[in-house]
């Protein structure tokens, strides 16, 4: 995945008080056991600041040594730092954990922008809100990185949540996750839950405060309003998705669906914006300009580079239109549509004008490597990684940030036809899907 | 070719509010795609950022003085006028009517600007 | 807020000289940086833009470099009318709001 423009990632914290929750729709999927109701000790788990990262505390090594892990649906190796580095407050020592064993192999893993390299090895892990159990898992000890680390982001290292085909050196390596199932009864399912502040934080602000959940093993109803509509997984190695409609403002982008799904669509906690293939979003953001006309913005606000700003509380909301996405559904020729505001793709920025002002940055953004859904889908939504069934679900978010005009919404069923001519089969190629 | 001119009264008395008009000639502000904007200079000072405003009527103003400026736009007329209430000595300045050109990012035109002295 | 800081505040040069002046922002504004020009008695005039590109009738003498947050207006052969006050302008936040303190240069 592109390190440079993946990270650093956004988060924000609050978002809309409980008592703007929506009603909850009743046709509800039957309870499984062990998979659904309240998971109380994981709920509020993730913490971050603003475009560098949701992160979660594990612990590593015996006795346990307390890291800040960025979650990362788009990657699959559990990445730590392992030596000084002046961004990190703190790092992993391996020469101090009774239970580490050197696997004696490196892994040098390089982006667009910036590597990280180190040594592999297992210990091992448990995560303090999560599940209660420890697993042995594979570890990358970073011990040289390049633009990796974010300073004052808070996190030490990565948790990569994707398959095996990914992982680096190569698909051998087991993921944490696998591990954790493996190892454990902990059924083959997490659920993410980010939210979006809709205001910039200051660093003590992030600290005290709470960014969401990541329900390891389980989906916690608290966390979502209404129905949970599922997308098949297409591939294991990504979250790969399928991308059969866009709509602004209702408006049919009308373009060939295979174009939105060029080369992969993917669900990417990593990444902090909506990235869309070069041409959707050349398309899109032609729509979106013609549909927030009464105001002209700079090039370089539709390019992500300038921050536009207006006095605190005057966000003119209502001129920018909703983004609607229909997914590929679990029925033949059905499909369903998540929705999002510009509460979620204009992504507040701290420290760049007064306190007076309120101040933003264009988070959708072009890609040469697909769609990828960040965090400026994720935060509308509570997202269900069901592992097990091969599915991704998609619920409102009971904690996105919304007005009293309009909220996101996961609306079905829609009937689409031919839907499987939507995915684009790439050609096998021995290069590395970093690097692209 | 583009020009701006500014005019309103030369001397205002404390309290009350100062109102300036900028006439733009040799183009339509409701034909092109720039913001309009209100910079003012004191004596012997920097260049303060006022506000500007859209040919939709949407305005921008500087957080300083949002509480005391109103700015508008009369397409029919050409025109478009600054307001700034309660004034006191603190308010006397050159002020400037200019057009945010060149990407709407830079203040590429202005007009000559006119001297407002607040005095009783 | 974005602070842009102009130095020095006094340029005393002779004409013919290379006079090099300096703005500097608190956090970047990547290439969004202009540059103008201030004679006694008149309205700014706008030389550069983006950070190096000459406005419209600008004489090559004058050019602009640097991004991020270290700027640099360079007047290659100062001419006599060049003698006036420079000032700075960000429009990373937008719309364009902020300009630096100013700098004068003065003939020697």
């Known amino acids: 995945t592109q390190h440079g423009i993946r990270l650093p990632l956004r988060s924000g914290l609050g978002g809309a008080p409980l008592g703007l929750r929506l009603p909850r729709e009743t046709d509800e999927e039957p309870e499984e056991p062990g998979r659904r109701g309240s998971f109380v000790e994981m709920v509020d788990n993730l913490r971050g600041k603003s475009g560098q990262g949701y992160y979660v505390e594990m612990t590593v090594g015996s006795p346990p040594q307390t890291l800040n892990i960025l979650v990362d649906t788009g990657s699959s190796n559990f990445a730590v730092g392992a030596a000084p580095h002046p961004f990190l407050h703190r790092y992993y020592q391996r020469q101090l954990s009774s239970t580490y064993r050197d696997l004696r192999k490196g892994v040098y893993v390089p982006y667009t922008q910036g590597k990280w390299e180190g040594e592999l090895g297992t210990d091992l892990v448990s995560i303090p809100h999560g599940p209660n159990v420890t697993v042995r898992a594979n570890i990358a000890a970073i011990t040289e990185s390049d633009k990796f680390f974010i300073n004052g982001s808070n996190w030490e290292g990565i948790l990569g949540l994707a398959y095996a085909e990914i992982a680096r050196p190569d698909d051998s390596l087991e993921p944490f996750f696998d591990s954790l199932v493996k190892q454990t009864h902990v059924p083959n399912l997490f659920s993410l839950q980010l939210c979006g502040a809709g205001f910039p934080l200051n660093q003590s602000e992030v600290l005290a405060s709470v960014g969401g959940s990541m329900i390891i093993g389980g989906i916690d109803h608290s966390l979502y309003t209404g129905s949970l509509w599922y997308t098949p997984i297409r591939r294991e190695w990504y979250y790969e998705v399928i991308i059969v409609r866009v709509e602004i403002n209702g408006q049919d982008l009308k373009m060939d669906c295979k174009e939105y799904n060029y080369d992969k669509s993917i669900v990417d906690s990593g990444t902090t914006n909506l990235r869309l293939p070069k041409k959707v979003f050349e398309a899109a953001v032609k729509s979106i300009k013609a549909a927030s006309s009464t105001e002209k913005f700079p090039d370089g606000f539709w390019l992500g580079e300038q921050l536009v700003c207006w006095q605190a509380g005057t966000t003119p909301w209502n001129i920018f239109p909703v983004i609607s996405l229909y997914l590929m559904g679990e029925v033949t020729n059905q499909s369903f549509r998540i929705t999002i505001l510009p509460q979620q793709y204009l992504r507040p920025v701290e420290d760049v004008a007064t306190s007076q002002d309120d101040c933003y940055k264009f988070a959708i953004s072009q890609s040469s490597t697909g769609t990828v859904m960040g965090a400026v889908i994720m935060e509308g939504f509570y997202v269900v990684f069901d592992r097990a069934r091969k599915r991704i679900g998609f619920a409102v978010s009971a904690c996105h940030v919304h007005d009293e005009f309009r909220t996101a919404a996961v609306e079905g069923p829609f009937v689409t036809l031919d839907m499987e001519d939507c995915g684009y089969n790439i050609p096998q190629t021995d290069e590395s899907t970093l690097m692209t | 070719q583009l020009q701006l001119q500014e005019s309103g009264p030369g001397l205002v008395k404390p309290s009350e509010t100062l109102s300036l008009t900028c006439t733009v000639s040799?183009?339509?502000?409701?034909?092109?795609?720039?913001?309009w904007s209100w910079i003012r200079q004191p004596p012997g000072k920097g260049l303060e950022w006022i506000g500007s405003?859209?040919?939709?009527?949407?305005?921008y103003y500087n957080p300083s003085l949002k509480s005391r400026v109103t700015i508008s736009v009369d397409t029919s007329k050409n025109q478009f006028s600054l307001k700034l209430s309660s004034v006191t000595a603190a308010d006397t300045a050159v002020y400037y009517c200019?057009?945010?050109?060149?990407?709407?990012?830079?203040?590429?035109?202005w007009g000559r600007g006119t001297l407002v002295t607040v005095s009783s | 807020e974005i602070v842009l800081t102009q130095s020095p505040a006094t340029l005393s040069l002779s004409p013919g000289e290379r006079a090099t002046l300096s703005c500097r922002a608190s956090?970047?504004?990547?290439?969004?940086l202009a540059w103008y020009q201030q004679k006694p008695g008149q309205a700014p005039r706008l030389l550069i833009y983006?950070?190096?590109n000459r406005a419209t009738g600008i004489p090559a003498r004058f050019s602009g470099s640097g991004s991020g947050t270290d700027f640099t207006l360079t007047i290659s052969s100062l001419e006599p009318e060049d003698f006036a006050v420079y000032y700075c302008?960000?429009?990373?936040?937008?719309?364009?709001?902020?300009f630096g303190g100013g700098t004068k240069v003065e003939i020697k």
């Open positions: 200019a057009r945010v050109g060149h990407g709407i990012n830079y203040f590429d035109l």
């Open positions: 040799g183009g339509s502000i409701s034909w092109s795609s720039y913001y």
């Open positions: 405003i859209y040919r939709s009527g949407r305005t």
């Open positions: 956090q970047s504004v990547s290439s969004y």
């Open positions: 983006d950070a190096s």
């Open positions: 302008q960000q429009s990373i936040t937008w719309p364009p709001r902020t």
